[in-house]
Interface confidence: medium
């Protein structure tokens, strides 16, 4: 007789894929551009990025440092109007790309909960809630909560009002610290909340440092559902050399939870190229045009355009591991499992009862190295087999689909490897 | 062909006030974008900002060393860039150019405008 | 703010001898994402407005004889001039434009022994 199936978790829509952050409109749209009739011709692109939510904004009316004159009822005159906004939903919604607002009050100021007011705050954003699930958002998001006096119980009456209202409705925190008992204080009053933090910002150095802190937040956590980040707001070039950004997009998308990225981590954005704008909210790279201070300073492969044109682009190799986060049982709700690989590497299993599992292995070294899996670390129902298909490798020049000899495998610096093989009774 | 002229330097007193102009000619004034370069009596050139393009929103660049005291303006229907200056210094002394950018780098210059500021 | 310092302050010159002029830069205008040296340079003849020789360090602007060449990456340019000419007497400026503001060499004085 056949086993029978485990039984599929309750799946919510950002359980499904990605979220893209899109903080500044005028940044991500460019040319003198930047509102809300605009982004709606730019739907098309996320949805071949095959993204679940897109974060935006804030877009709402705010003086800076200014309570009286910040109003998150009202859409900026600069992004549009509400009518804009609500084509703009309605267009998303057609796209199955649902919209997150973001709602940090004082975001062109100094403390972006104005300090000194923050009952007067808290009421604006209670209202606020109100006010955009009526008209149809799909979730919220606050940042820089470390700077909101009392935030877990302000989350949690949050996260009432936006579940109050639906089930399938969303709620992101997010805050600039990278403390997990801070982080786990945050979280410990408020089940379904996802939050955005800089815990894995300083990751980079190496394999083993990074499975640390990915498995100790994983145990910390529990069975709840987490997101994966750099930070809160900020791009992957903020942290990361450019030689580890595929190792990042693999992990990201292959980790248990929900992948959060910023406009332009899909193509390696990064203001160190730009001179004059900002590191937070550089100009996206569209064309070699976008950025027309320094002329020449933009080559082809730098932007969306060039590397649309390039399969072996970040941008195609984001594209693929998106589609892939989105359809795949294993990647969608599997189990995981960390396993030793040997030094500077990082390698675990996804896998869901009887569909096809998935191996990772990540080379965070500056040097190749031979991966000797420790499949006696796995417990029986994740165990290895003696092959697996190779999926994709961040590096060019490796035979995709070739079965490749686990006991043998050998990685390239900074490569990452996906692998798959089926369920084995 | 592509044509600055600078016109408006002269003598100031020190905390006084100056517009210095110029008029362009040769090039689609709206697409470019242009700056303003200085250069002290017998000293190097100093970079003061920049004024962009129509499709840049005509946004501006500054220097720590004049921002809040200088603005740079420009009138397209007559293809003319402006210098405001306000509360001139004595080290504010020099001759000032307008230049068509690329926009980093330097391309076109004018001739250049002598502004002195002394008591 | 990122200085640019040219050496030497003076150079005297021999028609038909190659000259060298240098410029360090107090950080590195090499940007990894695209391998660009954020550097141009300039020449002032005497009583002229300045104009463009070199930019990207080692890109000749149109029109510029190919006597002018520039090398270098990072924090290290040099503009060469293969075979000097008697019209090329003047100040010779370097220029950074990685990061606001953009700042100019104190100059070298090019003349004729």
């Known amino acids: 007789r056949a086993p029978r199936c485990r039984e599929l978790p309750a799946q919510k829509w950002w359980h499904t894929g990605a979220l893209y952050r899109i903080g500044d409109l005028q940044a991500f749209q460019g040319h003198g551009a930047g509102n809300l009739a605009g982004l709606k011709g730019r739907l098309d692109y996320l949805s071949s990025l095959k993204v679940k939510g897109l974060v935006l904004g804030p877009i709402h009316k705010n003086q800076k440092d200014d309570v009286a004159q910040t109003d998150l009822l009202q859409i900026d005159p600069n992004f549009g109007s509400k009518e804009d906004f609500d084509s703009l939903l309605q267009s998303a919604k057609k796209k199955s790309i649902r919209v997150i607002l973001d709602l940090t009050p004082n975001y062109r100021g100094e403390n972006s909960w104005f300090s000194t007011q923050v009952d007067t705050v808290a009421t604006k954003v209670k209202d606020a809630l109100e006010f955009w699930l009526q008209a149809g958002v799909d979730g919220f998001q606050v940042r820089d909560i470390e700077n909101l006096k009392d935030a877990s119980s302000f989350l949690a009456e949050w996260q009432n009002i936006t579940k109050g209202f639906s089930e399938d409705r969303l709620l992101i925190a997010g805050t600039n610290s990278s403390d997990l008992q801070q982080i786990l204080s945050l979280l410990e009053s408020n089940k379904d909340l996802l939050l955005t933090s800089s815990y894995l910002s300083d990751s980079g150095s190496t394999g083993e440092h990074t499975k640390s802190l990915v498995t100790q937040y994983l145990n910390a956590t529990g069975n709840r559902w987490c997101s994966w980040s750099l930070s809160q707001a900020r791009l992957l070039t903020s942290f990361l050399p450019a030689q580890l950004l595929r190792l990042y997009q693999l992990m990201l998308f292959t980790l248990p939870g929900t992948p959060v990225f910023s406009y332009g981590d899909e193509i390696g954005l990064d203001a160190a190229a730009l001179p004059g704008q900002p590191m937070e909210a550089p100009v996206m790279l569209w064309d070699e045009s976008s950025f027309p201070d320094i002329p020449g300073a933009v080559s082809a492969n730098m932007t969306v355009k060039g590397q649309s044109e390039d399969p072996g682009s970040l941008l195609s190799l984001f594209r693929r591991l998106s589609d892939q986060r989105s359809k795949e049982r294993s990647l969608l709700h599997g189990d995981f499992h960390a396993f030793s690989a040997g030094p500077g590497l990082f390698s675990y299993i996804r896998h869901w009862d009887q569909n096809e599992r998935f191996l990772v292995v990540l080379n965070f070294g500056d040097v190749g190295l031979s991966a000797g899996l420790q499949a006696s670390d796995l417990p029986a129902s994740a165990s290895l087999p003696a092959k697996a298909d190779l999926l994709l490798s961040t590096q060019p020049g490796r035979e995709e689909g070739s079965p490749l000899e686990l006991e043998r495998l050998k990685l390239e610096p900074h490569e990452g490897l996906l692998l798959r093989f089926p369920y084995a009774a | 062909e592509v044509q600055l002229v600078e016109s408006g330097g002269g003598l100031v007193k020190p905390g006084g006030s100056l517009r210095l102009s110029c008029a362009t000619s040769?090039?689609?004034?709206?697409?470019?974008?242009m700056s303003w370069v200085r250069q002290a009596p017998g000293k190097g050139l100093e970079w003061l900002g920049f004024i962009r393009n129509k499709a840049n929103r005509y946004t501006t660049e500054y220097s720590a060393s004049v921002k809040g005291r200088f603005t740079i303006s420009r009138d397209n229907s007559k293809s003319i860039l402006y210098l405001q200056m306000n509360s001139l210094k004595t080290e504010d002394t020099a001759v000032y150019y307008c230049?068509?950018?690329?926009?980093?780098?330097?391309?076109?210059w004018g001739q250049g405008t002598l502004v002195t500021v002394s008591s | 703010d990122i200085v640019m310092t040219q050496t030497p302050l003076s150079l005297p010159v021999t028609p038909g001898e190659p000259a060298s002029i240098s410029c360090k830069s107090s950080?590195?205008?090499?940007?990894?994402?695209?391998?660009?040296?954020?550097l141009a340079w300039y020449l002032q003849k005497p009583g002229q407005s300045p104009q463009l020789l070199i930019y990207?360090?080692?890109t000749r602007e149109s029109g510029v004889p190919d006597r002018f060449s520039g090398s270098g990456s990072g924090t290290d340019f040099t503009l060469k001039i293969s075979r000097v000419e008697a019209e090329d007497v003047g100040v010779y400026y370097c220029q950074q434009y990685y990061s606001y503001p953009y700042t100019f060499g104190g100059g070298t004085k090019v003349e004729i022994k």
């Open positions: 230049t068509r950018d690329r926009p980093a780098w330097f391309v076109y």
């Open positions: 040769g090039f689609t004034f709206i697409d470019y974008y």
């Open positions: 990207w360090a080692s």
């Open positions: 950080q590195s205008l090499l940007y990894s994402s695209n391998q660009k040296n954020y």
